[in-house]
């Protein structure tokens, strides 16, 4: 099983803890990280059959956006 | 765009060692995801772990203890050391690249490890 | 472990046929409203080439014949319309829990 705060959030616990300025939340361990460390979803073109991801969240947008538009990574939460 | 060219592989005793490199070029081993997977002879994709951009291994609990992942990063190239090895290890081993969510979107080309007397 | 399960293990289809390949998983694979459920193709020979990652996200370069849907435990596959160069192997893999799992695959051949 994955160690960090993943092991202890509940199916409906708050979102993860938010990361600084110019670190990005890592989805597969858990935490937070500076971004360059991580590869970023590439855009898509035009006219894909689903919908991007954002590449960044707002400091108002939530995490637990649905799977269509997560909005990931996700830098500088606050 | 990543490529992976993985070598090493070939025909060793029960009981013996290997150890597969797989080159990256096209980004730094000192970003992302970088993953070992096998495939036995007409069967399923096994994952066997990973390395990330901190060093940090995660392994298969059923290979953990014979196999190790490693880099480095000056020669931007990732390593499975086998130990012990076994009849049932015998596969095609790829490493392949994750993406954001780990979906694996780069892959080498294989190297066959062949365990047999 | 999550235990990925995929069915049917193999079917036979026609060029021009709608294909459906099932995976379930032995618990949810979601997370921060994501389901971390990817599907990969594989012809012999050839390393797996990712089709759909996060259930239902086009991989770049894929044909839009493919799709994915689901989200918890059970997701789906989807070709469309099939084309003779899909006849292939199909993996479903999770990568929300340590250790990462694939499915057993599904074989897809010509009838």
């Known amino acids: 099983m994955r160690r960090g705060p993943r092991s202890l959030r509940g199916r409906d616990a708050p979102a993860p803890t938010p990361c600084v300025p110019a670190e990005c939340f890592d989805l597969l361990v858990r935490h937070c990280v500076a971004c360059g460390l991580l590869r970023t979803p590439r855009p898509k073109p035009a006219g894909a059959s689903s919908p991007a991801p954002r590449t960044a969240l707002q400091p108002q947008e939530s995490v637990g956006a649905g799977a269509g538009e997560a909005a990931l990574p996700l830098p500088g939460l606050l | 765009e990543v490529q992976l060219v993985e070598s090493g592989g070939g025909l060793v005793q029960p009981g013996g060692s290997l150890r597969l490199s797989c080159a990256a070029s096209?980004?730094?081993?000192?970003?992302?995801?970088w993953n070992w997977v096998r495939q036995a002879p007409g069967k399923g994709l096994e994952w066997v772990g990973y390395?990330?951009?901190?060093?940090?291994?995660y392994y298969n609990p059923s290979l953990k203890s014979r196999f190790t992942i490693s880099r480095d990063t000056s020669k931007n190239t990732l390593y499975l050391q086998m130990n012990s090895l076994r009849a049932e290890d015998t596969a095609v081993y790829y490493c392949a690249n994750s993406n954001f969510y780990g979906a694996m979107d780069y892959w080498g080309q294989g190297t066959l490890v062949t365990v047999s007397s | 472990d999550i235990q990925m399960t995929q069915s049917p293990s193999s079917l036979s289809a026609s060029v021009g046929d709608r294909v459906t390949i099932t995976c379930r998983a032995s618990?949810?694979?979601?997370?921060?409203?994501?389901?971390?459920m990817h599907w990969y193709q594989q012809k012999p020979g050839k390393a797996p080439k990712l089709l759909i990652y996060r259930a239902s996200d086009l991989e770049s370069g894929v044909p839009s014949r493919f799709s994915g849907s689901g989200s918890g435990t059970d997701f789906t596959l989807t070709i469309s319309s099939l084309q003779p160069e899909d006849f292939a192997t199909y993996y479903c893999q999770q990568t929300s829990k340590d250790p990462w799992t694939f499915g057993q695959g599904t074989k897809v051949e010509i009838k």
């Open positions: 618990e949810s694979v979601d997370d921060y409203g994501i389901s971390f």
């Open positions: 096209g980004d730094s081993i000192t970003r992302g995801y």
């Open positions: 390395i990330n951009y901190s060093g940090t291994t």
